[in-house]
C-alpha cells in the first residue's frame, strides 16, 4: 500500500542553528523514506532534505542548515513519503521565517533595587548572542516572591537599537526577595525562547507596614483589676523579612483619655492589668526607617454584655485542610477572629489567632496543626469595635486510632446480667474524637456478641447471659480512623439469685 500522507507539518527556525520541520508520519507498515522539498530565497531557490534515520520517530523530522537559511524569507515546505509501492505528497505549507524563529534565552546578570525608589527592582540582562539584528525582540518577565510558587508575568518589547537592556519592575512588596526569569522572542515570532536562568533580587526596606492586634481576657482578680494579655503580629501581607526594632503601646479608659499610659517592648505580647471599665489600646511598631500605622483595639468593661450571633459551627477535613464553617444570625457582621490552641491539661501557651473577613468559614493546612492532637477552636464575631460572644468547638486536623483502649470494670454481676463500666480515655491518648464504644463479650467456648453505644455512654448492662458461666468482655473505643480495645476482663455469672 502507498504510504500515509504526511500531516501536521510544523517548522521552527532555531536561529542561526537550523530550520527543523516535523510531521505526523501516519501508521507505516513498511519502510518509508521522507523527503522535505523546500523553496526559499523568496521562491528563487529550492532544495531537498532527506531523512536518513532507521528509527520511525527520527524519520518524521528533517533539518536545513546555514548558509542556506536567510531571514527574512518565505518558504514553501512539502513532505514526500516514499515506499516500495509509490510516493505520496503532503499539502504544500507556507512559512515566513520571522514568524517561526526561536532564539536562545537572554542572560540576566543583575537584579537590584534602585536607591531611593521604593517597591521596585531593576533587571539588567544581555540579549541572546544569536538574535536577528534586523528584528525587535519582545520579552516576558516572570517573577515571584521566594516563598511563593505562583508566577506573575509582565510583557514588554525592546527596540533593536536600544542599548539599554534593563526593565524596572514596580508595584512590588518592600523588603522582599523576588525570583526573576526572562524569555524573549523575535517580535513577529510565535516561538518564545526557553526561560533564562533564575536570578534573585530584593526590594528596599521600608517602615513596618502595620500590625494586627488581639487580646485574651482573663477573669477579674480580687482587687477588681483584670489581666488582659495583648497579642500582636505583622499585618497580613507584610514582607516576610520585615524587621521591627520594637513596639510602642498606649492605653486609656474609654471615659478619660487623659489617663493614658504608655509602654515600650520588644516582645510580641504583653500582660496588662486594667480596671473594670472599658479601655482603648493602641500600638505601633517601628524600625530604623519609621513607624507603622496605628493598630487599635477596644477592651470591653467587665460587666459589658457581648452580643451573640453564631448559631451553629462545624469542622471537617477536606483535601489536606481543616475547614471550620459557621452560621450567623447577624448579617452585618462580616469580620471574625479565630483562636485555636491544643487542648492540653496545662494552660494553653501556644494560642494562635487569625482574622477572617467576608466569609463564614476558615481553613488551615493540615500540616500546620499537629496530627492526633485535639484543638480548641473559637470564633469571635467582630462588629466595628465590639467583639461578640465566641462559639467554640473541638477538632482534630488528623485523627488516628486511640493509643489505648478504655479502662474497664464489671459491676453488679447477676445470674443473667452484668454492668460493664469504663472510663474515658485520657485526652492525650485519644488521637481523635471518640465517636462510639463497642462492647465485645463471649461465653467460654461460645459465640461472641457485640454492642455499640455512642460516645456519651460510659456503662452498659448486658442481659440474657447464661447462669454460672465464665465470660470474657472487652470495650473498644473508636475514632473515625478506627478502634482500640481495652484490656479484657473475665467474670462469671452467679448460679442463683437471692430473688429466686
Amino acid at each position: 500500500a502507498l504510504p500515509a500522507k504526511p500531516e501536521n507539518i510544523s517548522c521552527v527556525y532555531y536561529y542561526r542553528k537550523n530550520l527543523t520541520c516535523t510531521w505526523s508520519p501516519g501508521k507505516e507498515t513498511s519502510y518509508t523514506q521522507y523527503t522535505v522539498k523546500r523553496t526559499y530565497a523568496f521562491g528563487e531557490k529550492h532544495d531537498n532534505c532527506t531523512t536518513n534515520s532507521s528509527t520511525s520517530e527520527n524519520r518524521a523530522s528533517c533539518s536545513f542548515f546555514l548558509p542556506r537559511i536567510t531571514i527574512p524569507d518565505n518558504y514553501t515546505i512539502e513532505v514526500e513519503a516514499e515506499n516500495g509501492d509509490g510516493v505520496i505528497k503532503s499539502h504544500m505549507t507556507y512559512w515566513r521565517l520571522e514568524n517561526i524563529a526561536k532564539t536562545e534565552p537572554p542572560k540576566i546578570f543583575r537584579v537590584k533595587p534602585v536607591l531611593g525608589i521604593k517597591r521596585m527592582i531593576q533587571i539588567e540582562w544581555i540579549k541572546p548572542e544569536l538574535a536577528p539584528v534586523s528584528s525587535d525582540l519582545k520579552y516576558t518577565l516572570r517573577f515571584r516572591t521566594v516563598n511563593s510558587t505562583s508566577w506573575m508575568e509582565v510583557n514588554f518589547a525592546k527596540n533593536r537599537k536600544d542599548k539599554n537592556q534593563t526593565y524596572n519592575l514596580t508595584g512590588l512588596q518592600p523588603f522582599t526577595e523576588y525570583v526573576i526569569a526572562l524569555r524573549c522572542a523575535v517580535k513577529e515570532s510565535k516561538f518564545w525562547s526557553d526561560w533564562s536562568q533564575e536570578k534573585m533580587g530584593m526590594t528596599e526596606e521600608e517602615a513596618p507596614c502595620g500590625l494586627e492586634l488581639w487580646r485574651v481576657l482573663k477573669p477579674a482578680e480580687a482587687d477588681g483589676r483584670r489581666p488582659v494579655r495583648l497579642l500582636w503580629k505583622k499585618a497580613r501581607g507584610a514582607p516576610v523579612l520585615e524587621k521591627t526594632l520594637g513596639y510602642n503601646i498606649w492605653y486609656y479608659p474609654e471615659s478619660n483619655t487623659n489617663l493614658t499610659e504608655t509602654m515600650n517592648t520588644t516582645n510580641q505580647q504583653l500582660e496588662l492589668h486594667l480596671g473594670g471599665e472599658s479601655f482603648w489600646v493602641s500600638m505601633i511598631s517601628y524600625n530604623s526607617l519609621g513607624k507603622s500605622p496605628v493598630a487599635t483595639l477596644r477592651i470591653p468593661a467587665i460587666q459589658e454584655k457581648s452580643f451573640q450571633c453564631i448559631e451553629v459551627m462545624q469542622a471537617c477535613v477536606a483535601e489536606d485542610q481543616l475547614v471550620v464553617k459557621w452560621q450567623s444570625s447577624a448579617l452585618d457582621v462580616n469580620t471574625w477572629m479565630i483562636e485555636w490552641f491544643p487542648d492540653v491539661d496545662s494552660e494553653p501557651t501556644t494560642l494562635s489567632w487569625e482574622s477572617v473577613s467576608q466569609a463564614t468559614n476558615w481553613t488551615i493546612q493540615q500540616d500546620k496543626l499537629k496530627p492526633f492532637w485535639c484543638y480548641n477552636i473559637s470564633v469571635y464575631p467582630m462588629l466595628h469595635d465590639k467583639v461578640g460572644e465566641p462559639y467554640s468547638i473541638q477538632a482534630y486536623a488528623k485523627e488516628g486510632v486511640p493509643s489505648e483502649g478504655p479502662e474497664t470494670k464489671v459491676e453488679n454481676i447477676g445470674v443473667k446480667t452484668v454492668t460493664i463500666t469504663w472510663k474515658e480515655i485520657p485526652k492525650s491518648e485519644r488521637k481523635g474524637i471518640i465517636c462510639n464504644y463497642t462492647i465485645f463479650y463471649q461465653a467460654e467456648g461460645g459465640k461472641g456478641f457485640s454492642k455499640t453505644v455512642n460516645s456519651s455512654i460510659l456503662q452498659y448492662g448486658l442481659e440474657s447471659l447464661k447462669r454460672k458461666t465464665s465470660y470474657i468482655v472487652q470495650v473498644m473505643a473508636s475514632t473515625s480512623a478506627g478502634g482500640t480495645n481495652g484490656t479484657s476482663i473475665n467474670f462469671k455469672t452467679l448460679s442463683f439469685s437471692v430473688f429466686e
Epitope: R16, K17, A41, P72, S134
Partner: antibody
Framework: QVQLVQSGAEVKKPGASVKVSCKAS????????LNWVRQAPGQGLEWMGL????????DYNPQFQDRVTITADKSTSTAYMELSSLRSEDTAVYYC??????????????WGQGTLVTVSS | DIQMTQSPSSLSASVGDRVTITCQAS??????VAWYQQKPGKAPKLLIY???TEAQGVPSRFSGSGSGTDFTLTISSLQPEDFATYYC?????????FGGGTKVEIK
C-alpha cells in the same frame, strides 16, 4: 568585537600539505559559517569552501574538492583549512572569512588578516 | 559554475568623480551580488550585498544596483581613501565566484 586571527606564514615543498588555523572570538562560533578564500600574488580572489561549525557541514569548490579539508573545533572556536599535494601555483594568501548578515548568505563580512603560504622547492 | 565578468579591469579617476563599475553574471542570479573593497596588503572589506544593501559602517557614497545578470557599483564622489581594487561576488549558492577585480587609480 568579532575577530578572526589566523596562524603565521608557512613555507612548504611541492607535494606537502599545509594546515592553516583561524581562531574566532567575540561571537558565538557555532552561529556563523566560516569560508576560506585565497589570493595568489597580484591575482583575484578564489573561494575554496566553507564549514558550518554548528553541525560540521562543509561545502567545497569543485576545483579543490580532492585536496582541501575544512574542519572546526568548537571547544577552541577554531577552524582549520588543510590543503594537500601542494604545487607552486598554490602560493597565495589564504583568508578565513565569516558570514554576517541574516539576509545575505554566502557574504563575507569579517575577514582574518590572511596567512601567506609559499610553495617552493 | 556561475562566471562573474567585471569591467573595467582598471580605471583612473580624480577625487570628487563619480565612478561606476559593472559586473555581469553568466546566468540569472536575482539580486545575490556582493561588492568588496581591497587595499594593498589588507583583507577585502564588504561594501554591498543583495546587490544594493549597504554593509554596516559603509559610507553612503557607495551604492549598488541591478538584478538578474547585470550589476553596478557606484561611488558618487570619489574620496582619497577610495583608491583600491573592487571585486564583485555572487552569493547565490556555492561555489562562490568573484569577478576579476577593478583597480581604481588616481588620475
Amino acid at each position: 568585537q568579532v575577530q578572526l586571527v589566523q596562524s603565521g606564514a608557512e613555507v612548504k615543498k611541492p607535494g606537502a600539505s599545509v594546515k592553516v588555523s583561524c581562531k574566532a572570538s567575540g561571537y558565538t562560533f557555532t552561529g556563523y559559517v566560516l569560508n576560506w578564500v585565497r589570493q595568489a600574488p597580484g591575482q583575484g580572489l578564489e573561494w575554496m569552501g566553507l564549514i558550518n561549525p554548528y553541525n560540521g557541514g562543509t561545502d567545497y569548490n569543485p576545483q579543490f574538492q580532492d585536496r582541501v579539508t575544512i574542519t572546526a573545533d568548537k571547544s577552541t572556536s577554531t577552524a582549520y583549512m588543510e590543503l594537500s599535494s601542494l604545487r607552486s601555483e598554490d602560493t597565495a594568501v589564504y583568508y578565513c572569512a565569516r558570514d554576517g548578515y541574516d539576509d545575505g548568505p554566502y557574504t563575507l563580512e569579517t575577514w582574518g588578516q590572511g596567512t601567506l603560504v609559499t610553495v617552493s622547492s | 559554475d556561475i562566471q562573474m565578468t567585471q569591467s573595467p579591469s582598471s580605471l583612473s579617476a580624480s577625487v570628487g568623480d563619480r565612478v561606476t563599475i559593472t559586473c555581469q553574471a553568466s546566468e540569472d542570479i536575482y539580486s545575490f551580488v556582493a561588492w568588496y573593497q581591497q587595499k594593498p596588503g589588507k583583507a577585502p572589506k564588504l561594501l554591498i550585498y543583495n546587490a544594493q544593501t549597504e554593509a554596516q559602517g559603509v559610507p553612503s557614497r557607495f551604492s549598488g544596483s541591478g538584478s538578474g545578470t547585470d550589476f553596478t557599483l557606484t561611488i558618487s564622489s570619489l574620496q582619497p581613501e577610495d583608491f583600491a581594487t573592487y571585486y564583485c561576488q555572487h552569493h547565490y549558492d556555492s561555489p562562490l565566484t568573484f569577478g576579476g577585480g577593478t583597480k581604481v587609480e588616481i588620475k
